[in-house]
């Protein structure tokens, strides 16, 4: 006779935990409370991670790689909590952890699969190499291998060079795109599917501005609402390219609302900043101010680059003196 209400034999309850490199995580395990609790956490069914019985830890045979990195929630063991607090996870910690809990009346085994991800904030850089202009999306440390996509004027680009360097525990990735002579807008997206984290870099080229010497110029920089969230920490940097390298004119930190200005002729409008408008003025232009000006708005989730080309021409009177 087949039983009416039955439970099929489930060898182990399995959970997936996703951790971030160098951060602390909790491997969950619960049991029905009981007396004489024994808890053993093991890695890949062989390495001893943590042992507890007779009311205290017994770590004499703990694998050295877990030394000073594990602890239990001691005040909650009597309530059925056998979860493991795990400090500073590394990519080498990835794998299957088994928690054995025994009491005088019950025995359980829980399996926890730990996956570790890395996503150091990517950057979008604008570079000049000889006569060519490049946009480079790069991430210094990422795991697992990310998905990188480029768009030009919101249309996906199939061309996608990826320069990848693998280290022991993560990848370093550069994805350059040649944008020489283009006035289009570009977007690069880097997605870490494990951490469900996406970063977007957007580059916009503004029309060139022609100014006379001694005049002032206003350069606009307003974030695109799709990405920008004023509640999230971000940094705004204005810089000028001279002979292939950028020098910082000024920057603003949203966390402290600090503005640091390195160029005395540069001015920012505080009221506009409060409205998330980072347009700037550069006064008393001289011929050497000709060049490319870059506004970079960056957070953990995006980089918005706006580039202006400024041509400063001699004023009539200067020209007539010459």
């Amino acid at each position: 006779i087949f039983p009416l209400a039955f439970f099929i034999y489930v060898p182990m309850n399995e959970q997936i935990v996703i951790g971030r490199l160098d951060e602390d995580i909790i491997l969950p395990s619960s049991f029905e409370r009981g007396s004489e609790v024994v808890i053993h956490w093991k890695y890949q069914d062989s390495y001893k991670v943590h042992s507890y019985y007779k009311g205290s830890d017994h770590l004499e045979s703990q694998d050295p790689r877990y030394a000073n990195r594990t602890s239990l929630f001691y005040n909650e063991i009597q309530n059925g909590n056998a979860s493991l607090f795990f400090r500073r996870v590394s990519l080498l910690d990835e794998g299957i952890y088994t928690c054995y809990v025994g009491t005088a009346i019950q025995v359980i085994t829980n399996k926890v699969v730990l996956k570790v991800g890395v996503f150091l904030t990517p950057v979008m850089k604008y570079e000049k190499r000889n006569t060519n202009s490049f946009l480079i999306c790069s991430v210094l440390s990422v795991y697992p291998r990310p998905i990188i996509t480029w768009k030009m004027d919101n249309t996906p680009i199939s061309e996608n060079n990826m320069e990848e360097t693998g280290s022991l525990d993560s990848f370093s990735i550069n994805s350059p795109l040649n944008i020489t002579g283009s006035n289009s807008s570009y977007e690069c997206t880097i997605e870490n599917s494990l951490l469900k984290q996406t970063w977007t870099g957007r580059w916009t080229m503004k029309d060139g501005l022609h100014k006379m010497q001694s005049e002032h110029v206003s350069l606009s920089c307003q974030p695109v609402n799709d990405y920008f969230s004023p509640n999230q920490d971000f940094k705004v940097t204005w810089s000028r390219m001279k002979s292939g390298t950028f020098s910082v004119l000024a920057y603003y930190l949203s966390s402290s609302q600090n503005t640091i200005i390195n160029e005395s002729r540069f001015s920012w409008n505080k009221e506009l900043i409060n409205q998330s408008d980072f347009s700037m003025n550069l006064m008393d232009l001289n011929l050497s101010d000709s060049g490319e000006y870059l506004c970079n708005i960056s957070s953990d989730e995006y980089t918005l680059l706006t580039i202006h080309t400024v041509h400063v021409e001699p004023s009539q009177e200067t020209a007539s003196h010459n």
Epitope: F7, I8, Y9, V10, P11, M12, N13, E32, G34, E36, V38, H40, Y53, H58, E60, S61, Y100, G102, T103, A104, I105, Q106, V107, I108, T109
Partner: antibody, heavy 116, light 107 residues
């Protein structure tokens, strides 16, 4: 009084399956893990695995994975063990035993003979 | 898996004698050892757990001791009804494993 009453002896042919029952009384069935232990003739005891009546999950011995399936019927406070693809190696006495990591009450045992 | 070894398959003793049955674990099991008695034609009965804790109703002539890898079940004054097989079991970790058994015979 705690009691674990097992089903009677079984004579089965090689390749067949068999389901042994263990009916309990005298305690709250869902509070304890129910374990199963094999004792081959003239040999020692081998732990097969256990089942927690509340959630169906419990540890088991890898050696018996694919051989034994453990189930419970909470309404009748009965535990079951099904053994499949039987061979002469499976001929033994099988015990159900209540407990956590030690076994404080045992059934009387069910003798299984696998023979053609 | 942890291997439990009972080196003596048989032990012969007389009524009133003191007898010690030994069990060795292949690794430190931190006193997580139980002892069972199995009389002929019967199921095993729990005597001792956590190396030295006597189960309810077990006569006090049965005592357990040991630590690390070496464990002993001692019967201080053997009675005729103690004729049986004795098994040790480690309950330190799964899979739980038993010793091969020691048969106590009365001379």
């Amino acid at each position: 009084e705690v009691q674990l009453q097992q089903s009677g002896p079984e004579l089965v042919k090689p390749g067949a399956s068999v389901k042994i029952s263990c009916k309990t009384s005298g305690y709250t069935f869902t509070e304890y893990t129910m374990h199963w232990v094999k004792q081959s003739h003239g040999k020692s005891l081998e732990w097969i695995g256990g089942i927690n009546p509340n959630n169906g999950g419990a540890p088991y011995n890898q050696k018996f994975k694919g051989k034994a399936t453990l189930t419970v019927d909470k309404s009748s406070s009965t535990a079951y063990m099904e053994l499949r693809s039987l061979t002469s190696e499976d001929s033994a006495v099988y015990y159900c035993a209540r407990g956590g990591y030690y076994f404080d009450y045992w059934g009387q045992g069910t003798t299984l003979t696998v023979s053609s | 898996d942890i291997v439990m070894t009972q080196s003596h398959k048989f032990m012969s003793t007389s009524v009133g004698d003191r007898v010690s049955i030994t069990c060795k674990a292949s690794q430190d099991v931190s006193t997580a050892v139980a002892w069972y008695q199995q009389k002929s034609g019967q199921s095993p009965k729990l005597l001792i757990y956590w190396a030295s804790t006597r189960h309810t109703g077990v006569p006090d002539r049965f005592t357990g001791s040991g630590s690390g890898t070496d464990y002993t079940l001692t019967i201080s004054s053997v009675q005729a009804e103690d004729l049986a097989l004795y098994y040790c079991q480690q309950h330190y970790d799964t899979p739980f494993t038993f010793g091969g058994g020691t048969k106590l015979e009365i001379k």
